[in-house]
């Protein structure tokens, strides 16, 4: 329901700051609240646009504040308007100068049709001028200067709706800024009547509440609530459910509350006077202190709440026995709830006396739809209403309101619901690799449609054309291996993402199909890889005798170690070798093979070989001569890979002897990296050279090494390869 309240803080303007605050309490207007000048009520008022700002202390409130220097521009009539679902509600009020010649008895006056009415203004300044009275800015009445009474009155013996309006009084020489205003509200119906034809009976609107002539509902004064305004609010609170609070040091002092017609304006309970800054006299309470306490049994009268009944008594005058009523309170309802789209069962829990019934608890959606409990239970202290929303969707996000309305009063608790879209992967998972009983899957969980964060991921799989249920595994990484699959079987795969919260399982994403391999043959036996030339390698294997009648072939995969160059070659199954050609000289290749039928076989281990070199080999490196004795020495070296080095030659001769007197030791296994020279002469200097040979030729040594044998009696020595330039 729409609860719009306009607070006119200091309707009598002096040189102090003054304001208008319009509050939408307990509902969210679909359009902004507007505050404007009410030209209908007063045509010739100031034309300046108002500076309307958001009231930072409240979520749905607008405010106009006039600084003291703007006092001369404030006089006039104002309105606040709110709209929700096509229904507009307008509240009116006025502001006038405190230094006006006359002051009204009240800011507004509500009467019933047919009432005998006196609209009165109190003379505060004596002038030798005629007094004039206007209605909605038009002259209606004057009083000669010598007859202006202390109380200037407009008498309406039989008020009619057309008599309603803003009445103003001033001296004839004055103007708008010295005028006093009061607004007469005439209910369309006679006392206690309501309805389009005014022939329905009003309920009693207690504590100066007013029966709305169109709906029969009571408009409750600030500080009271409930269907008949019987229930007093907690101290310094107001609004239909008493959840708005006056923030002033003395509560609602100096706040004039204006409510929708036909209520008009009044002070909050406990206050009176045009500025609402006078406390009630003892024995009086309520708005404008118009209510008199008549408490039974000498109960205490509180100026805000009326009679404070002793335990076991209730009613306005504590005239009824019974457990005192307790305003309902909504408990255990968080301010914010995150909900996954789908089924949702919100719970409203409330206390109070009498305990709220099923019919008294409702849930209001942001669009204004009122929901009623699907399930209800209560304990000694609480009523619990369970609502069911079969399919809640993101547009349902927003402020929901749990509302409890009992004879003891009404309470509403807004809470924010954020409806999340269940996540669903946009892409099907990818199959990276398969075997006869496994598959390696990239689950491709991102990107996904919907809301995160993702709490967990499931990979769902099942064989196609089987009436089996989907199986699933929980997945933490993007890459996952599915094991224990059936060979030669088509499977379908999809991914389901799960977000936090109840019902967070999203719909499975797109489906990917794949087929497992048949059980494969073992790799060829006796595999051997040898270089044939600078551009060819030869792979050989033992003959293959398959166990089944299936056609088979050998698949050879060769790839370069140095370059990203790969080739797969199919070789008929009756052959036992393949020449791998079009290769690069002096390059290392990795080769593997498998035997395939319709199903792929298992790969062999990798074999590695270099193609023959296209250049002379480099000299052996790290040449060292060690363990020298009188007749022997150990010579060691290293050679570089990849130059097709087939042999190493060690050439040595006694220094000073002719070149043709050298000895050559040829080492045909290029993997050998040291050799012991024997049969040397003691105490003799030798010149040692070492060469590498490949398919192109021999390497060219840059210098020779010197070796001096020891005398026969000496221990072995290291020579570190002293160099002698050639």
């Amino acid at each position: 329901a729409m609860d719009l309240i306009l607070i006119n803080s200091l309707p009598l303007v002096s040189d102090a700051e003054t304001s208008l605050t319009c509050i939408a309490s307990g509902w969210r207007p679909h359009e902004p609240i507007t505050i404007g000048r009410d030209f209908e009520a007063l045509m010739n008022q100031h034309q300046d646009p108002l500076e309307v700002t958001q009231d930072v202390t409240r979520e749905w409130a607008k405010k106009v504040v006039w600084k003291r220097e703007k006092a001369s521009k404030i006089n006039g009539a104002y309105f606040c308007e709110g709209r929700v679902r096509g229904e507009a509600i307008r509240i009116r009020t006025m502001k006038m100068r405190q230094q006006a010649s006359f002051l009204p008895a009240t800011l507004t006056m509500t009467v019933d049709k047919g009432d005998n009415v006196n609209i009165s203004f109190k003379k505060v300044l004596i002038k030798e001028e005629d007094a004039v009275i206007y209605k909605n800015g038009s002259f209606i009445h004057s009083v000669p200067r010598h007859e202006v009474p202390d109380i200037l009155e407009v008498h309406l013996p039989h008020a009619q709706p057309q008599d309603a309006g803003v009445y103003s009084a001033r001296y004839i020489g004055g103007n708008l800024f010295t005028s006093a205003f009061t607004r007469l509200i005439v209910r369309r119906c006679e006392a206690q009547k309501w309805g389009p034809e005014c022939n329905h009976l009003c309920t009693a609107c207690m504590n100066n509440g007013v029966c709305h002539e169109d709906t029969g509902e009571c408009i409750c004064p600030p500080g009271f609530m409930g269907r008949t305004c019987e229930k007093a609010c907690e101290l310094h609170t107001f609004g239909r459910t008493c959840k708005e609070r006056c923030s002033g040091q003395e509560g609602c002092k100096s706040y004039v509350f204006c409510l929708p017609d036909p209520y008009g304006c009044s002070c909050a309970t406990g206050w009176k006077g045009l500025q609402c800054n006078e406390a009630c006299h003892p024995g009086f309470y309520g708005p404008d202190c118009k209510l008199r306490c008549s408490c039974n049994n000498g109960e205490m009268c509180d100026r805000f709440q009326g009679c404070l009944c002793s335990p076991g008594w209730q009613g306005l005058q504590c005239e009824r026995e019974g457990i005192p009523r307790m305003t309902p309170k909504i408990v255990d309802l968080p301010d914010h709830i995150e909900v996954n789209s789908g089924k949702f069962n919100p719970i409203c829990k409330a206390s109070g006396w009498p305990l709220p019934t099923n019919e008294e608890m409702t849930l209001v959606k942001p669009d204004g739809t009122v929901l009623h409990p699907k399930d209800f239970n209560h304990t000694d202290h609480f009523s619990v209403a369970i609502f069911t929303i079969h399919r809640i969707l993101p547009p349902d996000s927003g402020v929901w309101v749990c509302s409890v309305n009992t004879v003891a009063g009404m309470v509403e608790k807004p809470f924010n619901i954020s409806v999340k879209v269940l996540p669903k992967p946009l892409n099907a998972p990818n199959v990276i690799d398969t075997g006869h009983n496994f598959a390696v899957i990239n689950i491709s969980s991102e990107p996904y449609f919907g809301d995160g964060p993702i709490k967990s991921k499931k990979l769902l799989y099942k064989p196609v054309n089987h009436y089996e249920a989907w199986q699933h595994i929980q997945v933490t990484n993007e890459i996952v291996t599915l094991n224990y699959l059936e060979p030669r079987t088509e499977y379908e795969l999809c991914v389901q993402l799960v977000r936090r919260g109840e019902g967070g399982e999203g719909h499975p994403g797109p489906v990917r199909r794949f087929t497992t391999a048949s059980i494969g043959l073992p790799p060829p036996r006796g595999l051997n890889l040898l270089p044939k030339s600078q551009t060819t390698l030869n792979l050989t294997w033992q003959p293959i005798f398959p166990s089944s009648e299936d056609d088979f072939y050998v698949e050879v995969e060769r790839r370069s170690v140095q370059k990203s160059d790969q080739q797969n070659i199919k070789v008929p199954g009756n052959l036992t070798s393949v020449l791998l050609n079009n290769l690069h000289p002096r390059e290392q290749y990795v080769v593997r093979a498998r035997v395939n039928t319709k199903a792929q076989g298992e790969w062999s281990e990798d074999l590695t070989a270099w193609t023959l070199s296209d250049i002379l080999p480099p000299q052996p490196e790290n040449i060292k001569i060690s363990n020298i004795t009188h007749s022997s020495a150990v010579i060691s070296w290293t050679i570089l890979d990849g130059y097709s080095i087939s042999s190493i030659t060690i050439r040595y001769k006694v220094q000073g002897k002719n070149e043709d007197q050298h000895v050559d030791v040829k080492i045909k296994n290029a993997t050998i990296t040291q050799y012991q020279l024997k049969g040397l002469e003691p105490e003799t200097a030798y010149q040692v050279d070492i060469f590498a040979e490949n398919n192109i030729g021999s390497s060219n040594p840059a210098f020779s090494h010197e070796l001096v044998t020891l005398p026969e009696s000496q221990a072995p020595a290291d020579l570190g390869g002293g160099k002698m330039l050639l």
């Epitope: 096509g86 229904e87 206690q192 309805g195 389009p196 034809e197 022939n199 329905h200 009976l201 009003c202 309920t203 009693a204 207690m206 169109d214 709906t215 029969g216 509902e217 269907r227 008949t228 019987e230 009613g315 009498p354 004879v407």
Partner: antibody, heavy 117, light 113 residues
Framework: QVQLVQSGGGVVQPGRSLRLSCAAS????????MHWVRQAPGKGLEWVAV????????YYADSVKGRFTISRDNSKNMLQLQMNRLRSEDTAVYYC??????????WGQGTVITVSS | DIQMTQSPDSLAVSLGERATINCKSS????????????LAWYQQKPGQPPNLLMY???TRESGVPDRFSGSGSGTDFTLTISSLQAEDVAVYYC?????????FGQGTRLEIK
């Protein structure tokens, strides 16, 4: 829990009188206008009378005007319907009810009145 | 007095199907000042008092399932039960409160087909 408990029904001869009562609990009875509605056997609903919360205003259906009187005792939370000069067409189930605006929200359980010689 | 006429007098609908009851007033019950229709709907089960379902023509009373909805304006109104349940078997009445005396329609008996 708001409840309206009715009593006083029975069989009565034409031309005789009968008094129906309706006891209210769970609401501030003195704040609410109260209605009587009747339903003849196998027929629809017919509004009979209404009384204001303070008993000052009373209205009747044309069919019962001058014969029926609606009254209330707020100190006892009690509503009454005094039915005089009963006719056979007054035979019905009589309900008391509290309004919610112009609709009738809370109903008594009903009491059967049979006017027959 | 404003006369209220309901149609049909009786209606048989299968479980889960939509049920529609119409109500016509002899004069408009729409009040232009607030754009409200002064019309209520009641459900009455055998041996029980009527139970308020709707007021202002389309506002559901507390505790009434949301399969019940009210529509219409001026002189023509409809009560719709979107998916009939076994417990909805009853007599349904419309009532105007635009003007006193309040008046009811003659009722529509709803049964299961």
């Amino acid at each position: 829990q708001v409840q309206l408990v009715q009593s006083g029904g029975g069989v009565v001869q034409p031309g005789r009188s009968l008094r129906l009562s309706c006891a209210a609990s769970g609401l501030t009875f003195s704040n609410y206008a109260m209605h009587w509605v009747r339903q003849a056997p196998g027929k629809g609903l017919e509004w009979v009378a209404v009384i204001s919360y303070d008993g000052e205003n009373k209205y009747y259906a044309d069919s019962v005007k001058g014969r029926f009187t609606i009254s209330r005792d707020n100190s006892k939370n009690m509503l009454q319907l005094q039915m005089n000069r009963l006719r056979s067409e007054d035979t019905a189930v009589y309900y008391c009810a509290t309004p919610k605006g112009g609709a009738l929200e809370i109903w008594g359980q009903g009491t059967v009145i049979t006017v027959s010689s | 007095d404003i006369q209220m006429t309901q149609s049909p007098d009786s209606l048989a609908v299968s479980l889960g199907e939509r049920a529609t009851i119409n109500c016509k007033s002899s004069q408009s019950v729409l009040y232009s000042a607030n754009n409200k229709n002064y019309l209520a709907w009641y459900q009455q089960k055998p041996g029980q008092p009527p139970n308020l379902l709707m007021y202002w023509a389309s506002t559901r009373e507390s505790g009434v399932p949301d399969r019940f909805s009210g529509s219409g304006s001026g002189t023509d109104f409809t009560l719709t039960i979107s998916s009939l349940q076994a417990e909805d078997v009853a007599v349904y009445y419309c009532q105007q409160y635009y003007s006193a005396p309040i008046t009811f329609g003659q009722g529509t008996r709803l049964e299961i087909k």
